[in-house]
């Protein structure tokens, strides 16, 4: 059976939207009005992995682009990157470990924990216009909570 996917946008808990910053980076900033069209639309795929009521394994692709968020070690540090893939082969049910995030729902907010690096989360900075990154702390200065907005196909 083909992998189930949905289209969505994400905003952090400060209502910052995610936009492309160069070919392989996302940044978070406040958008209004027509500028909202700049925000990236994700194709969130529901993939194979350990699942529970509040934790669902997903992959986050950029809609109609052959790019996925992935987590790898760079200079011995877990790092978030946008990785290009062969569109003939993705998305798929059995994604490589680096592409998998545990979507965790807590109090109507979402966290995205790296399956490859437990306790590391997709994060944004308090500051405007800064890169989206993989952070190893929750509840500190950096933001790890998001809301999801469904986008019609």
């Amino acid at each position: 059976a083909p992998v189930r996917s949905l289209n969505c946008t994400l905003r952090d808990s400060q209502q910052k939207s995610l936009v492309m910053s160069g070919p392989y980076e996302l940044k978070a900033l406040h958008l209004q009005g027509q500028d909202m069209e700049q925000q990236v639309v994700f194709s969130m795929s529901f993939v194979q992995g350990e699942e529970s009521n509040d934790k669902i394994p997903v992959a986050l692709g950029l809609k109609e682009k052959n790019l996925y968020l992935s987590c790898v070690l760079k200079d011995d540090k877990p790092t978030l990157q946008l990785e290009s893939v062969d569109p003939k082969n993705y998305p798929k049910k059995k994604m490589e470990k680096r592409f998998v995030f545990n979507k965790i729902e807590i109090n109507n907010k979402l966290e995205f924990e790296s399956a490859q690096f437990p306790n590391w989360y997709i994060s944004t900075s308090q500051a405007e216009n800064m890169p989206v990154f993989l952070g190893g702390t929750k509840g500190g200065q950096d933001i790890t909570d998001f809301t999801m907005q469904f986008v019609s196909s």
């Epitope: 992995g49 790898v72 490589e96 470990k97 680096r98 490859q116 690096f117």
Partner: antibody, heavy 120, light 107 residues
Framework: EVQLVESGGGLVQPGGSLRLSCAAS??????????VGWVRQAPGKGLEWVSH???????SYNPSLKSRFTISRDNSKNTLYLQMNSLRAEDTAVYYC????????????WGQGTLVTVSS | EIVMTQSPSTLSASVGDRVIITCRAS??????LSWYQQKPGKAPKLLIY???KLHSGVPSRFSGSGSGAEFTLTISSLQPDDFATYYC?????????FGQGTKLTVK
């Protein structure tokens, strides 16, 4: 010092089954980010990736083998297994246990290998 | 699956020679490539990972380069201990696949 010691190889008839073991020491199979798997090498041939399991139990298989081979592990014994069913002559190979950390993989440590011969 | 093709399949060289082995992928594999050395009756040994990073304890005469779909392993000055078979491995996409190997022999 990391050590991987395979056992369980031997002569088996076509259609038969065999379970290989890989006893690991010097590290824990359940350490976050840890991966271990099996790579085989038919006599006089190249290397072929067989199967892999991550610290959290996430398994991957070579699609050509998945229906017949099952990877598992026992964390209490720090041991990796490969259950091989419906064996064929072309499964004759040295089977190596190999360790990596994180994806994408590179195999840092290898066992000495155990020979599986499928013949009547 | 991604097919990895090594060239040449066999290579004859002398001590002191500079040797280059090529590995081509059937599609872009980023820099997710590692190289292994294997001697007869022994397990493979990791030489290089992430295309160009030298594994600890590996002599500096070994180096790796490339990106996308074409990669090279270079031995700058061949030593007697280097006669062996060399394999590349792609880790971009499951199933992980090896090249068919390059056997390095004494000329």
């Amino acid at each position: 010092e990391v050590q991987l010691v395979e056992s369980g190889g031997g002569l088996v008839q076509p259609g038969g089954s065999l379970r290989l073991s890989c006893a690991a020491s010097g590290f824990s199979l359940s350490t976050s980010g840890m991966g271990v798997g099996w790579v085989r090498q038919a006599p006089g041939k190249g290397l072929e990736w067989v199967s892999h399991i991550w610290w959290d139990g996430d398994e991957s298989y070579n699609p050509s083998l998945k229906s017949r081979f099952t990877i598992s592990r026992d964390n209490s014994k720090n041991t990796l297994y490969l259950q091989m069913n419906s064996l064929r002559a072309e499964d004759t190979a040295v089977y190596y246990c190999a360790k990596n950390r994180y994806d994408p993989p590179w195999f840092v440590d290898w066992g000495q290998g155990t020979l599986v011969t499928v013949s009547s | 699956e991604i097919v990895m093709t090594q060239s040449p399949s066999t290579l004859s060289a002398s001590v002191g020679d500079r040797v280059i082995i090529t590995c081509r992928a059937s599609q872009d594999i980023s820099n997710y490539l590692s190289w292994y050395q294997q001697k007869p009756g022994k397990a493979p040994k990791l030489l290089i990972y992430y295309t160009s990073k030298l594994h600890s304890g590996v002599p500096s005469r070994f180096s790796g380069s490339g990106s996308g779909a074409e990669f090279t392993l270079t031995i700058s000055s061949l030593q007697p201990d280097d006669f062996a078979t060399y394999y590349c491995l792609q880790g971009k996409m499951l199933p992980w696949t090896f090249g068919q190997g390059t056997k390095l022999t004494v000329k």
